[in-house]
Interface confidence: medium
C-alpha cells in the first residue's frame, strides 16, 4: 500500500507512517515503528505539558517568585502550567503575570473608587464638592465635609476637594 | 531618618491575645498608609492587614478577618495590631511597613509572635 501522506487527528507523520501523539500530560520516548506503539512517558513532578504532543521534553512549571511579589494561584498539573497572581496590595504588570507592582495611591483631592485587586490597579475619582481627601492613599474614599450646623457651629473656612471646613463659633450678638 | 519600632510580640497559648504597636519617626505619620507583613519560619512575606492614613479604612488579609484589629493613634505616630484567638500558624516575625508608590520602602526590624502550647 502507498505510505500515508497524512494522518488523522492525534497523530503525526514519521518514517512515511502515522504514528500517535502523547496525550497531555505525557512526553515522547520513542516514535512507533511497523511493530511497536508511540512510547510515551508522564511528566515528572514540576513538569507539564498542556496538548496532545510528540515532544521529547515537558515543560517546567512557572514559578512563582515571592520577590516579585507573586504567589500561586493554581498549582500546576501534569497537564497545566502552575498560575501566578500578585500578593494583597499588588497587581501584575502584564496578562502573564511575570510580575507585580504596589497598587498606586489616590494623591489629595482624589479618593479611592475601586479598590485595587491582583489584576488591576487602584482607580481613584475627584473628590467631589462636599468632599475631601487631604491625604496620598491607596485605601482611603473621599469624605464628607464637616457638618457645621448639627454641632451648633457656623463655617469660619470653606472646604475644597483637599480640605474639610473649619468650624467656628456663631457670633454672639451683643445686647 | 525614618525608623519604624515594632513590639508586643512574645509567647502566647493558641486562643490567646497580642496587641503589636509600631512607634514611628522621621516622616509624616498621619499622611501614610501603613501595613502590617508577617514572615512565618521558612516562608516568604504574607501581607496582613493595612490601614489609611486618617485611620478610617481597613483591610485584612482573609486569613486574620474576623479576629485581628488594625487601629493606629496619629497623635502618638503609632500603628497597632489588637491579635485575637490567635493559632499556631500565626506563628511569624511580625513587620509594620511604610510606602511609597512603587515599593514598601520602610521596614521595622519585627516582633516575633510564637503562637504554641
Known amino acids: 500500500p502507498e505510505p500515508p501522506t497524512a494522518c488523522r487527528e492525534k497523530q503525526y507523520l514519521i518514517n512515511s507512517q502515522c504514528c500517535s501523539l502523547c496525550q497531555p500530560g505525557q512526553k515522547l520516548v520513542s516514535d512507533c515503528t511497523e511493530f511497536t506503539e508511540t512510547e510515551c512517558l508522564p511528566c515528572g513532578e514540576s513538569e507539564f505539558l498542556d496538548t496532545w504532543n510528540r515532544e521529547t521534553h515537558c515543560h517546567q512549571h512557572k514559578y512563582c517568585d515571592p520577590n516579585l511579589g507573586l504567589r500561586v494561584q493554581q498549582k500546576g498539573t501534569s497537564e497545566t502550567d502552575t498560575i501566578c497572581t500578585c500578593e494583597e496590595g499588588w497587581h501584575c504588570t502584564s496578562e502573564a503575570c511575570e510580575s507585580c507592582v504596589l497598587h498606586r495611591s489616590c494623591s489629595p483631592g482624589f479618593g479611592v473608587k475601586q479598590i485595587a485587586t491582583g489584576v488591576s490597579d487602584t482607580i481613584c475619582e475627584p473628590c467631589p464638592v462636599g468632599f475631601f481627601s487631604n491625604v496620598s492613599s491607596a485605601f482611603e474614599k473621599c469624605h464628607p465635609w464637616t457638618s457645621c450646623e448639627t454641632k451648633d457651629l457656623v463655617v469660619q473656612q470653606a472646604g475644597t476637594n483637599k480640605t474639610d471646613v473649619v468650624c467656628g463659633p456663631q457670633d454672639r450678638l451683643r445686647a | 531618618e525614618v525608623q519604624l519600632l515594632e513590639s508586643g510580640g512574645g509567647l502566647v497559648q493558641p486562643g490567646g491575645s497580642l496587641r503589636l504597636s509600631c512607634a514611628a519617626s522621621?516622616?509624616?505619620?498621619?499622611?501614610?498608609?501603613m501595613t502590617w507583613v508577617r514572615q512565618a519560619p521558612g516562608k516568604g512575606l504574607e501581607w496582613v492587614s493595612s490601614?489609611?492614613?486618617?485611620?478610617?479604612?481597613?483591610y485584612y488579609a482573609d486569613s486574620v478577618k474576623g479576629r485581628f484589629t488594625i487601629s493606629r493613634d496619629n497623635s502618638k505616630n503609632t500603628l497597632y495590631l489588637q491579635m485575637n484567638s490567635l493559632r499556631a500558624e500565626d506563628t511569624a516575625v511580625y513587620y509594620c511597613a511604610k510606602r511609597t508608590r512603587s515599593k514598601f520602602d520602610y521596614w521595622g526590624q519585627g516582633t516575633l509572635v510564637t503562637v504554641s502550647s
Open positions: 490601614i489609611s492614613p486618617n485611620g478610617w479604612d481597613t
Open positions: 522621621g516622616f509624616t505619620f498621619s499622611h501614610e498608609d
